[in-house]
Amino acid sequence: GQNITARIGEPLVLSCKGAPKKPPQQLEWKLNTGRTEAWKVLSPQGGPWDSVARILPNGSLLLPATGIVDEGTFRCRATNRRGKEVKSNYRVRVYQIPGKPEIVDPASELTASVPNKVGTCVSEGSYPAGTLSWHLDGKLLIPDGKETLVKEETRRHPETGLFTLRSELTVIPTQGGTHPTFSCSFSLGLPRRRPLNTAPIQLRVREPGPPEGIQLLVEPEGGIVAPGGTVTLTCAISAQPPPQVHWIKDGAPLPLAPSPVLLLPEVGHEDEGTYSCVATHPSHGPQESPPVSIRVTETGDEGPAEGSVGESGLGTLA
């Protein structure tokens, strides 16, 4: 048999070998495709199947617009002018080239020694599904699950049957100061079909510097609160990835799950004290914020106590 590849939506003509070019002809076309459950013999007189597969006057079979459901086997059996039976057998596969793949949500820069999401490569409207590959400086990137991690997702459109592919690349660059170029390509895996490439993205890799500073914000401002009130402490840190934040009261760690926000509801005198937060960054170890004092007192009793954060509500460590 002969393997035929046809583009979805395009016409396809399959010739019936041995068939006389004009009637009278003795021929039979049958097909086994996604439209049939077994072999379907086409009527030479034509009929409802003509919209998907029509026998032409010369004995060839015309598929006016091939679709995914037309994938399968097509056979013709013809008797030639000398009375000899000739058979033709075709295995039809269809394909659809998607739009040019794109890298969506690309990173603006990368940080050495930590995982960085480079971006997500998206290809829409392919058949069969095909594959997405990442390239670094023009060379194929092989995911190793450690320094190079690829998360893939394939979805099929419920009506068209066409595929959307997504591939998210995460890398851990080894050193700073470099400018790697990433690109992504889509391949259908068909012969004589070149891959489709995205526009490349060039990213700067910076060495992981210390976080620019920790700010401890307190609400209400000044850290003075009436009994039964609520105090919110927020540890603000500009670091990627976000570090784990623990809390310290009067020099002792609080036995709480890591969180950048500490909420003290219905405060009493036992909640008074000096609070600070500690941010633990994977590549830099812990960093502690300046402390803030919390005072529980009837409002208007006294001004800010010594060591409190004063009017700004901020304690900043540069």
Epitope: R35, E37, Q45, G46, P48, W49, S51, V52, R54
Partner: antibody, heavy 119, light 107 residues
């Protein structure tokens, strides 16, 4: 909304001719096969003719072959049935329907028009 | 030509009843069968396409099934508006062939 509206003079003598029309709207007419179906008074449904979306290929049952001709004008979104050599047994309500090939079957139907063949 | 033998030709049922109508094709027609509902003086309305698929806007109490060349239309709980005549249609081969119809009447 898909709409099919049949029209054509209702009473004709045996041996006479009649042309039915069907005006289509609410869909891309030239993407669909079209079909005529009839129903004699108190009887079941009978296929009369089909035409492919381009108008190049037409199909008939033996009962009307060589007497009836189905045609279409895609520019006017219109379907026609030319009926010649009419017989008493052609008396029926004639329906225009969208489809007729294996992708659709018949999905939308017009309200029908009554053709009476009588002397 | 393909024959579509529809049974029963008529039936009496009450509101809430489960109703089953069958069409048997004289040869293999694949999945290429539609079911229609027709009320007096009205055009047929498609209920089921390609043997088992519910057409848009049709209540879910209607369903279609297939076993070889036997096709079944089921109304799970008959409603007052369901009293009508039902037809099957094969559209796998020409001539397109309808079943003889089943008239569903109030008991």
């Amino acid at each position: 909304e898909v709409q099919l509206v049949e029209s054509g003079v209702g009473l004709v003598q045996p041996g006479g001719s009649l042309r039915l029309s069907c005006a289509a709207s609410g869909f891309t007419f030239n993407n669909y096969w079209m079909t005529w179906v009839r129903q004699a008074p108190g009887k079941g449904l009978e296929w009369v003719a089909s035409i492919d979306n381009s108008g190049d290929n037409t199909y008939y049952p033996d009962s009307v072959k060589d007497r009836f001709t189905i045609s279409r004008d895609n520019a006017k979104n219109s379907l026609y049935l030319q009926m010649n050599s009419l017989r008493a047994e052609d008396t029926a309500v004639y329906y225009c329907a969208r489809g007729g090939d294996i992708t659709n079957g018949l999905d939308y139907w017009g309200q029908g028009t009554l053709v009476t063949v009588s002397s | 030509d393909i024959q579509m033998t529809q049974s029963p030709s008529s039936l009496s049922a009450s509101v809430g009843d489960r109703v089953t109508i069958t069409c048997r094709a004289s040869q293999d027609v694949g999945i290429y069968v539609n079911w229609f509902q027709q009320k007096p003086g009205k055009a047929p309305r498609r209920l089921i396409y390609r043997a088992t698929n519910l057409a848009d806007g049709v209540p879910s109490r209607f369903s279609g099934s297939r076993s070889g060349t036997d096709f079944t239309l089921t109304i799970s709980s008959l409603q007052p508006e369901d009293f009508a005549t039902y037809y099957c249609l094969e559209f796998d081969e020409h001539p397109l062939t309808f079943g003889g119809g089943t008239k569903v009447e109030i008991k």
